[in-house]
């Protein structure tokens, strides 16, 4: 058993049918010695008397808010949460496996640049009685500071019969140098509590590996005289690290017909313009990627050919 | 400690092409190592990230773009002095700081070159003959060093009398390649910045 926060305790249980559970001793936070009784949640049934209460915690029915009273007055509370260990592996019931980029990916994180700011998000099908708390650091043995905000509900989607909820959090490394070569990964730890179930999820990454630039901005077409060709031009996104000659991007330009089946013409360039043939009803899209470290491509920025 | 935004003559910067070749070569070598050594801990998540140039060179600090010198997190107190007569510096007006930066890059390349050659000698003794260093990568390191053209003491290749532990050598190869790829990215960024300056 360990303390999650004041008066909230997590009991770790080896989770299998008929498991013996864990013996837990609760102590009433009071100078009083006599006439103390204990109850669980809203029940008025007295579970025991005395300054301490010994319980065998086996299942969720044994978890909850234990209260000690004296003569109708509440003295203190202890909330017990359960953390299930199933065959040596901590349970992951609360969050959905996003399976990208690999199985058992519960937290996904992205950064728009090298400033040390990043966003993480996760999915769940649970809509109520759910709380999250996020901590982060650079490295784990001698951790350096990363400050995270509060997790917020950022999106709701319908997936088949289920509603899916996306939560996200923004974090910022306290003293980040965009040009630095990372040798210690960023660690992100999310505590999740659903009713009386506690789970924790972690992700470890280098900022360089989670970079995903914003799409190029100011995408424009300039028709070339007496030709089906157009000059496409664009600019670096505002959110990208500067100077751009140091933090350079490379670009992919795509001409896509109306039908998805039509052949896509693609050009790769380090410049911020390209000459392409604009077909009728086609659209031109441009996306960006770090020129020197191949992390994710940005989403496409698009304009119609007409 | 940082790079001034100078305006050198166009096309004065032969090192850019070499640095791009270097990044391509080390990335290919790392990919090959990860595939060949699939039963070894060779992914970024599994290895310890060690920098063999730590406390010996200060490339990131010496080559910091002028725009980032206002960022206190980028200013490290480490200062190292280097010899300053590189041929990438085609203009006499090029500052001392730029020379310091390129000299630091040269020292990095020299250290990695020695490590890779020593390692390759060990890998050639492996009866499994599982993996060797790509000669193209070693050649590209050499080309960039020649383009930088700094006079520097030659570092003798390390020789080891004891029987090599091939498992450890292969893991060390992965660690070195990961670190060298990160340094090659920095070198490419620096060359791109200098080319645009």
């Amino acid at each position: 058993i360990w303390e999650l926060k004041k008066d909230v305790y997590v009991v770790e249980l080896d989770w299998y049918p008929d498991a013996p559970g864990e013996m837990v001793v609760l102590t009433c936070d009071t100078p009083e010695e006599d006439g103390i009784t204990w109850t669980l949640d809203q029940s008025s049934e007295v579970l025991g008397s005395g300054k301490t209460l010994t319980i065998q915690v086996k299942e969720f029915g044994d978890a909850g808010q234990y209260t000690c009273h004296k003569g109708g007055e509440v003295l203190s509370h202890s909330l017990l949460l359960l953390h299930k260990k199933e065959d040596g592996i901590w349970s992951t019931d609360i969050l959905k496996d996003q399976k990208e980029p690999k199985n058992k990916t519960f937290l996904r994180c992205e950064a728009k640049n090298y400033s040390g700011r990043f966003t993480c998000w996760w999915l769940t099908t649970i809509s109520t009685d759910l709380t999250f708390s996020v901590k982060s650091s650079r490295g784990s043995s001698d951790p350096q500071g990363v400050t995270c905000g509060a997790a917020t509900l950022s999106a709701e989607r319908v997936r088949g019969d289920n509603k899916e909820y996306e939560y996200s959090v923004e974090c910022q490394e306290d003293s980040a140098c965009p040009a630095a070569e990372e040798s210690l990964p960023i660690e992100v730890m999310v505590d999740a509590v659903h009713k009386l179930k506690y789970e924790n999820y972690t992700s470890s990454f280098f900022i360089r590996d989670i970079i995903k630039p914003d799409p190029p901005k100011n995408l424009q077409l300039k028709p070339l005289k007496n030709s089906r060709q157009v000059e496409v031009s664009w600019e670096y996104p505002d959110t990208w690290s500067t100077p751009h000659s140091y933090f350079s991007l490379t670009f992919c330009v795509q001409v896509q017909g109306k039908s998805k089946r039509e052949k896509k013409d693609r050009v790769f360039t380090d410049k911020t313009s390209a000459t392409v043939i604009c077909r009728k009803n086609a659209s031109i899209s441009v996306r960006a990627q770090d020129r020197y470290y191949s992390s994710s491509w940005s989403e496409w920025a698009s304009v119609p050919c007409s | 400690r940082n790079l001034p935004v100078a305006t050198p003559d166009p096309g004065m910067f032969p090192c850019l092409h070499h640095s791009q070749n270097l990044l391509r070569a080390v990335s290919n070598m790392l990919q090959k190592a990860r595939q060949t050594l699939e039963f070894y801990p060779c992914t970024s998540e599994e290895i310890d990230h060690e920098d063999i140039t730590k406390d010996k060179t200060s490339t990131v600090e010496a080559c910091l773009p002028l725009e980032l010198t206002k960022n206190e997190s980028c200013l490290n107190s480490r200062e190292t002095s280097f010899i300053t007569n590189g041929s990438c510096l085609a203009s006499r007006k090029t500052s001392f700081m730029m020379a310091l930066c390129l000299s630091s890059i040269y020292e990095d390349l020299k250290m990695y070159q020695v490590e890779f050659k020593t390692m390759n000698a060990k890998l050639l003794m492996d009866p499994k003959r599982q993996i060797f260093l790509d000669q193209n990568m070693l050649a590209v390191i050499d080309e960039l060093m020649q383009a930088l053209n700094f006079n520097s003491e030659t570092v003798p290749q390390k020789s080891s009398l004891e029987e090599p532990d091939f498992y450890k050598t292969k893991i060390k190869l992965c660690i070195l390649l990961h670190a060298f790829r990160i340094r090659a990215v920095t070198i490419d960024r620096v060359m791109s910045y200098l080319n645009a300056s």
């Epitope: 080896d14 989770w15 299998y16 049918p17 008929d18 498991a19 299942e59 969720f60 260990k85 199933e86 065959d87 040596g88 592996i89 019931d93 690999k102 199985n103 058992k104 099908t125 | 039963f39 801990p41 599994e46």
Partner: antibody, heavy 115, light 112 residues
Framework: QVQLVQSGGGVVQPGRSLRLSCAAS????????MHWVRQAPGKGLEWVAF????????YYADSVKGRFTISRDNSKNTLYLQMKSLRAEDTAVYYC????????WGQGTMVTVSS | SYVLTQPPSVSGTPGQRVTISCSGG????????VKWYQQLPGTAPKLLIY???QRPSGVPDRFSGSKSGTSASLAITGVQAEDEADYYC????????????FGTGTKVTVLG
């Protein structure tokens, strides 16, 4: 004490269907994940499928994906394995089993796929 | 499809020490705990060892398990006639958990 009693096995022709049941007692069935494991005659153990405690997630071995469906009825304390498009290579003793560091197995039920 | 490799058979005379190896990789045994099962003919498997080296109550202390790196082993010290059975190791794989990964199985024969 914990008990898993299996039923539903038998002889079936290739291409036909069969549903296996596993009735649980002696524990809070709705709190635990469950597996199906099979063993072809004279062969080793092969995992078939897993279902979470609340039925929200199901996982299958590649060899049965798209043909077998694992399900559970927590109100009836029963685990099921619906097997469709049966093949000769599905012939085996099928076991249900609880998920956890200490596990409990059903007695096994024989499924024979033969024309 | 078996990723955990066991010797097909091992044998020993009563009282001898018998060991069974279970060889895997970084993504399975290297990352997860190992269980060992005993299966007597015509019966369901019985758990002998969980968590690499833990014995459930009721399992004789002549059975012991250990794990090192990407391999595990089961030792029977002072093997007895009633130990003649098939033995299976089991773990998980990082990429496919909660799918159970079983070893190929080892037939233990007690001679004499």
């Amino acid at each position: 004490q914990v008990q898993l009693v299996q039923s539903g096995g038998g002889v079936v022709q290739p291409g036909r269907s069969l549903r296996l049941s596993c009735a649980a007692s002696g524990f809070t069935f709705s709190s635990y994940g469950m597996h199906w494991v099979r063993q072809a005659p004279g062969k080793g153990l092969e995992w078939v499928a897993f279902i979470r405690y609340d039925g929200s997630n199901k996982y299958y071995a590649d060899s049965v994906k798209g043909r077998f469906t694992i399900s559970r009825d927590n109100s009836k304390n029963t685990l099921y394995l619906q097997m469709k498009s049966l093949r000769a290579e599905d012939t085996a003793v099928y076991y249900c089993k609880t998920h956890g560091s200490h596990d409990n197995w059903g007695q096994g039920t024989m499924v024979t796929v033969s024309s | 499809s078996y990723v955990l490799t066991q010797p097909p058979s091992v044998s020993g005379t009563p009282g001898q020490r018998v060991t069974i190896s279970c060889s895997g990789g970084r993504s399975n045994i290297g990352s997860h705990t190992v269980k060992w099962y005993q299966q007597l003919p015509g019966t369901a498997p019985k758990l002998l060892i969980y968590g690499n080296d833990q014995r459930p109550s009721g399992v004789p202390d002549r059975f012991s398990g250990s794990k090192s790196g990407t391999s595990a082993s089961l030792a029977i010290t002072g093997v007895q006639a009633e130990d003649e059975a098939d033995y299976y190791c089991q773990s998980y794989d990082r990429g496919t958990h909660p799918a159970l990964l079983f070893g190929t199985g080892t037939k233990v024969t007690v001679l004499g």
